[in-house]
């Protein structure tokens, strides 16, 4: 029977800068029941606080609700493992909520095949930002990435969409069923998980574009739609 091994805080994530959760890995338990507590202070203060919620994030976690989440403040935290034989402490972890944001995936991904009479067909997709993110505050800039592949293909084709919430793709294989997904990340932070796959059947008469044409065609489509919207 021994004191517990050293725990490690290995991850902290926030869905929206308003709340966050940290998780730790226990060390060895020394063969005895072990209690864990996470304590922290905010930089510039010496008053220590204890984790307010050990439940919400699951085992070996600490969840910080809205009233415990401060923007622009660094948290200095550690985990203490205690059993009958003694205690051990994790290394201190410095956490700034700004840099640990991992949003939920974008929502409402819709995909359509557009076949204008006078131009080449294209795949058009649009989506919404995740619910928890309030883009109106200006705190957030979300960047988006799309991936798609024919249903039976192994490799994904990835496109960076920047801040826009719609995208057009011209080079597709006619007659194939495609899977399409989108994900997002804040300017500082982590990519979300991919959204659930949306399936789209590409018609057999879809005109295949070569890659070089893609950019030119996309610009033509953008110009054409912009022209239509404003006149």
């Amino acid at each position: 029977q021994l004191p517990p091994g050293k725990p490690e805080i290995f991850k902290c994530r926030s869905p929206n800068k308003e709340t966050f959760t940290c998780w730790w890995r226990p060390g060895t338990d020394g063969g005895l029941p072990t209690n864990y507590s996470l304590t922290y202070h905010r930089e510039g203060e010496t008053l220590m606080h204890e984790c307010p919620d050990y439940i919400t994030g699951g085992p070996n976690s600490c969840h910080f609700g809205k009233q415990y989440t401060s923007m622009w403040r660094t948290y200095v935290m550690m985990v203490n493992a205690t059993n009958q034989m003694g205690s051990s402490f994790s290394d201190e972890l410095y956490v700034d909520v700004t840099y640990i944001v991992q949003p939920d995936p974008p929502l409402e991904l819709t995909v359509e095949v557009k076949q204008p009479e006078d131009r080449k067909p294209y795949l058009w997709m649009k989506w919404s930002p995740p619910t928890l993110i309030d883009l109106k505050t200006g705190w957030f800039t979300l960047l988006y990435e799309i991936r798609l592949k024919p249903e039976k293909a192994a490799e994904w084709e990835t496109h960076f969409a920047g801040q826009q919430t719609e995208f057009k793709i011209l080079s597709l294989h006619p007659g194939q069923k495609y899977l399409v997904q989108v994900r997002c990340k804040p300017d500082h932070g982590y990519w979300s998980a991919w959204s659930p796959a949306t399936f789209i059947q590409i018609p057999s008469d879809f005109i295949m574009n070569d890659g070089l044409n893609d950019i030119f065609e996309a610009q033509k489509i953008e110009w054409h739609e912009h022209h239509h919207h404003h006149h």
């Epitope: 304590t39 203060e45 010496t46 606080h49 204890e50 609700g65 415990y68």
Partner: antibody
Framework: EVQLVESGGGLVQPGGSLRLSCAAS????????MNWVRQAPGKGLEWVAY????????YYADSVKGRFTISRDNSKNTLYLQMNSLRAEDTAVYYC???????????WGQGTLVTVSS | DIQMTQSPSSLSASVGDRVTITCRAS?????LHWYQQKPGKAPKLWIY???KLASGVPSRFSGSGSGNDYTLTISSLQPEDFATYYC?????????FGQGTKVEIK
């Protein structure tokens, strides 16, 4: 509605002991740091002790260290202050207060009077 | 320990007056909080995080400051504002109050 109700005050002789209780309701008691603050008759406010949500962190004012013990029972939504070796200068109204996030003392109980006198 | 020094310790003012109470901390703070107390009553949180008004506090109250120096201002004193006001720091152990400023009717 958040409520904090103190009890256990009374008259005690110097050197005696007393245990104060604070019954909390209307919020998730186990998520909040709690404090005792006191006020001697006609004097200002003095912070006495702090206990974190899971009792891992405890602080005392120097004036009570070694004599007072703060504790809590989250299953009973109750905060305690065990006061030993009481002195005349401990005479005060004792208030139970909570920390709301980083906002100290957003709610207070009505207070309980402790009088130390022979 | 962080010492909190309020000034003045008491003041007499008339309804409609502008009143300013100051609080100086012996060490630099990030935030300071203010409480109002009326005789025979428990104190109430009045201003938190230096400048945020607690629920139900009239907009004639304001708080400001940074570092070591903070102020509570009442732009136009009303009869219900006559009370004692305490500043408080909750950033470092031990937690400390100012000695209080009693606002009395002139």
């Amino acid at each position: 509605e958040v409520q904090l109700v103190e009890s256990g005050g009374g008259l005690v002789q110097p050197g005696g002991s007393l245990r104060l209780s604070c019954a909390a309701s209307g919020f998730t008691f186990s998520s909040f740091g709690m404090n005792w603050v006191r006020q001697a008759p006609g004097k200002g406010l003095e912070w006495v002790a702090y206990i974190s949500s899971g009792s891992s962190i405890i602080y005392y004012a120097d004036s009570v260290k070694g004599r007072f013990t703060i504790s809590r029972d989250n299953s009973k939504n109750t905060l305690y202050l065990q006061m030993n070796s009481l002195r005349a200068e401990d005479t005060a109204v004792y208030y139970c207060t909570r920390f709301y996030g980083y906002i100290p003392f957003d709610y207070w109980g009505q207070g309980t009077l402790v009088t130390v006198s022979s | 320990d962080i010492q909190m020094t309020q000034s003045p310790s008491s003041l007499s003012a008339s309804v409609g007056d502008r009143v300013t109470i100051t609080c100086r901390a012996s060490s630099s703070l990030i935030y300071l909080h203010w409480y109002q107390q009326k005789p025979g009553k428990a104190p109430k949180l009045w201003i938190y995080d230096t400048s945020k008004l607690a629920s139900g506090v009239p907009s004639r109250f304001s708080g400001s400051g940074s570092g070591n120096d903070y102020t509570l201002t009442i732009s136009s004193l009303q009869p219900e504002d006559f009370a004692t006001y305490y500043c408080f720091q909750g950033s470092g152990y031990p937690l400390t109050f100012g000695q209080g400023t009693k606002v009395e009717i002139k």
